[in-house]
């Protein structure tokens, strides 16, 4: 008979996760040879300690820490970029400007990156019908546990001017329940990050007002003012030129606004 | 289970240009680097490059620079070498290989391709 | 480049012999990061695609029978088979696994009197 299984809200666990966490470990460290020392078997070991085993409705930061401390990487100062509900163009331009890193361009994030994951309590297997929905289950999931840890970090560690890509299209354009509103803005630190910059990307074409001057950007504007560190805003009109000027910045279209 | 399939035999004029296929089952591509290798008859193994079939990003040994091209078709989940301008140097067997924690675990069949006029 | 030298070439022996196939390579393939040498041996079997047997110069790869045995760190490589069996007819073959371009060594080419 097939063992009883807790029933959750939330999608299962990734089809063939350990394999692509391996995979995509190997691969990571092929292509950054600044972490050829890493031990992707280990890194595998400490990933799966995390959930495995355990209810996954009590996950804590602490159980990741063997991982973050195997995944521990730098990103130069002035070259952190944060974003929120805009992963895609994020991604499409640190692909670009290769010398800039969001989250999931770091050993970690990379690892984690649009899987799921969750075992179950006293039994060594992963859940692969479903997982804990943050919403309709519980916050304190694999998932969203392992996010909410490796921001912090993430954040922790950023210096220079940080940058932060946010979607301008919303209706909350910076959300105080977003990871970046509630984990990585309040764990910037004003002794090593002197300045946040946000650029607001529009969705619309004709979409020519000041983003800048949005309700919620005053808001984070004002958070992190009260944390002693300077903030600047950008709207980013043209994302499509934007990301084309990033590309060949000698064109001559890109001496104009974006 | 792991498998790397490659595609048919090929013999081809010296000048002419082939692309070899190499079609992954058992794992999505695009979270593993594609590896291409050279085995020359009664001969020992060169390492071509890699291609990340993610974003194309390509690596290649300075011999192979100019030599080879490779692709990647994530869709198909199939990496391609290229290979133009051909000479009797380059008939070989084409391994395509994928590396799991260290080392090239993974293999496929190989490729002959003969280059005689 | 790393070149990888292998010697000897070529070797004869009976089954059930021990045998030992030296690898040298031009530069140091130990990661001062963790303190491993990134080496690996294959075994090529004619007709058939390279095996991998053992990676970080010593790790047996899953199915390799235990009488495959890597051992040696820098840049001085041996694998030894401790009583040779007449399925070990094959090529071996090292490999720089540690920096670009990837370099394999010319193979030593075993085979049973």
């Known amino acids: 008979l097939p063992r009883w299984r807790q029933q959750w809200s939330g999608s299962g666990t990734t089809s063939r996760f350990p394999e692509t966490v391996l995979a995509r470990c190997v691969k990571y460290t092929e292509v950054h040879p600044e972490m050829r020392h890493v031990d992707c078997q280990s890194v595998w070991d400490a990933f799966k300690g995390a959930f495995i085993s355990k209810y996954p409705c009590n996950i804590t930061e602490e159980d990741y820490q063997p991982l973050v401390k195997l995944g521990t990487q730098t990103v130069p100062c002035n070259k952190t970029l944060l974003w929120s509900r805009i992963k895609d163009l994020a991604h499409q331009f640190t692909q670009v400007q290769r010398d800039m890193f969001t989250l999931e361009d770091m050993l970690l994030g990379y690892l984690a990156d649009d899987l799921t994951w969750c075992g179950e309590f006293n039994t060594f297997e992963i859940n692969y019908q479903s997982c804990p929905d943050w919403r309709k289950d519980c916050s304190n999931n694999p998932v969203s546990v392992f996010w909410k840890t490796v921001s912090r970090r993430f954040a922790e560690t950023a210096c220079g001017v940080v940058h932060v890509m946010l979607n301008g299209s919303r209706s909350k354009i910076f959300d105080k329940n977003s990871t970046f509103g509630s984990v990585e803005v309040h764990n910037l630190q004003p002794e090593k990050v002197q300045a946040l910059e946000a650029w607001v990307i529009h969705g619309g074409r004709e979409d020519s007002r000041d983003l800048c001057q949005d309700p919620t950007i005053k808001e984070l504007e004002s958070i992190i003012s009260k944390r002693n560190i300077r903030f600047f805003c950008k709207n980013i009109y043209r994302p499509d030129k934007f990301l084309q000027c990033v590309k060949n910045p000698e064109d001559s279209s890109c001496l104009s606004g974006i | 289970e792991v498998q790397l399939q490659q595609s048919g035999a090929e013999f081809v004029r010296p000048g002419a240009s082939v692309k070899l296929s190499c079609t992954a089952s058992g794992f999505n591509i695009k979270d593993s680097l594609m590896h291409w290798v050279k085995q020359r008859p009664e001969q020992g193994l060169e390492w071509i490059g890699w291609i990340d079939p993610e974003d194309d990003k390509t690596k290649y040994a300075p011999k192979f620079q100019d030599e080879a091209t490779l692709t990647a078709d994530t869709s198909s989940n199939t990496a391609y070498l290229h290979l133009s301008s051909l000479t009797s140097e380059d008939t070989a067997i084409y391994y395509c290989?994928?590396?799991?924690?260290?080392?090239?675990?993974?293999w496929g069949q190989g490729t002959l391709v003969t280059v005689s006029a | 480049d790393i070149v990888m030298t292998q010697s000897p070439s070529s070797l004869s022996v009976s089954a059930g012999e021990k045998v030992t196939m030296s690898c040298k390579s031009s530069q140091s393939l130990l990661n001062s990061g963790n303190q491993k040498n990134y080496l690996a041996w294959y075994q090529q079997k004619p007709g058939q695609p390279p095996k991998l047997l053992i990676y970080g110069a010593s790790t047996r790869e899953s199915g390799v029978p235990d009488r495959f045995t890597g051992s040696g760190s820098g840049t001085d490589f041996t694998l030894t088979i401790s009583s040779v069996q007449a399925e070990d007819l094959a090529v071996y073959y090292c490999?720089?696994?540690?920096?670009?371009?990837?370099?394999f060594g010319g193979g030593t080419k075993l085979e049973i009197k």
């Open positions: 490999q720089n696994d540690h920096s670009y371009p990837y370099t």
């Open positions: 290989a994928r590396r799991f924690l260290r080392g090239f675990a993974y």
